[in-house]
Amino acid sequence: ACDTATCVTHRLAGLLSRSGGVVKNNFVPTNVGSKAF
């Protein structure tokens, strides 16, 4: 899977959207690596 910073950002945005934004406060692109997915 793509693990560039931009891919991580878009993947996280999709995850947030699907979860209704109910995730930990520190779950932001600069805090998570590609392995978080």
Partner: antibody, heavy 119, light 107 residues
């Protein structure tokens, strides 16, 4: 609203260095990567690199590695790009850009900084 | 580095026309392509990410498709503000790379 405001135009001599700033507002600066992009006059876009404001980590385009240095000052929500050993072909507009998710999911760009390298 | 080749480089067209721009990648980049519109003297404005998703506020006349090595941006009915340069970008691999641009001119 989200804004990226860059420093003003610069005219510098070949061999010198320059440091361009990009001040972010309207979002949590440390949450999102900051990218830097070059656009020479009449030319296309060229990615220089990105910086993680959360820990200072960087990725560089090999073409700019060793001459470009990306840093941040989180206390003032500002990213910097320093370019050293300047040459005439560094004359270009330089942009900062960041994709945010909160408060809005969008790819924001600064207004650009014109760098002119001339003796 | 991944090379992105856009076609055509220039296109003369009219308000109301349907326009399709192609972006071909030298290697498989999955769906990880973005499209931008840039007007002279202005910063690029983001339109599409992940090949086919419009950013908030981008008019529905803009649509993107493709995956792998071939991508398209379609403008269903050109408006006066759409005469500009359109640029694709891949972000699947470092360094990110951009296409050379497609300039839409008024016929």
């Amino acid at each position: 609203q989200v804004q990226l405001v860059q420093s003003g135009a610069e005219v510098v001599k070949p061999g010198a260095s320059v440091k361009i700033s990009c001040k972010a507002s309207g979002y949590t600066f440390t949450d999102y990567y900051m990218n830097w992009v070059k656009q020479a006059p009449g030319q296309g876009l060229e990615w220089i690199g990105d910086v993680n404001p959360n820990n200072g980590g960087t990725h560089y385009n090999q073409k700019f590695k060793g001459r470009a240095t990306l840093t941040v000052d989180t206390s003032i929500s500002t990213a910097y790009m320093e370019l050293s050993r300047l040459r005439s072909d560094d004359t270009a507009v330089y942009y900062c850009a960041s994709i945010t998710i909160v408060p809005v999911y969008f790819d924001f760009w600064g207004q650009g900084t014109l760098l002119t390298v001339s003796s | 580095d991944i090379q992105l080749t856009q076609s055509p480089s220039f296109l003369s067209t009219s308000v109301g026309d349907r326009v399709t721009i192609t972006c071909k990648a030298s290697q498989n980049v999955g769906p990880n392509v973005a499209w931008y519109r840039q007007k002279p003297g202005k910063s690029p404005k983001a339109l599409i990410y992940s090949a086919s998703y419009r950013y908030s506020g981008v008019p529905s006349r803009f649509s993107g498709s493709g995956s792998g090595t071939e991508f398209t941006l379609t403008i269903s009915s050109l408006q006066p503000e759409d005469f500009a340069t359109y640029i694709c970008q891949q972000y699947n691999y470092y360094p990110y790379t951009f296409g050379q641009g497609t300039k839409l001119e008024i016929k």
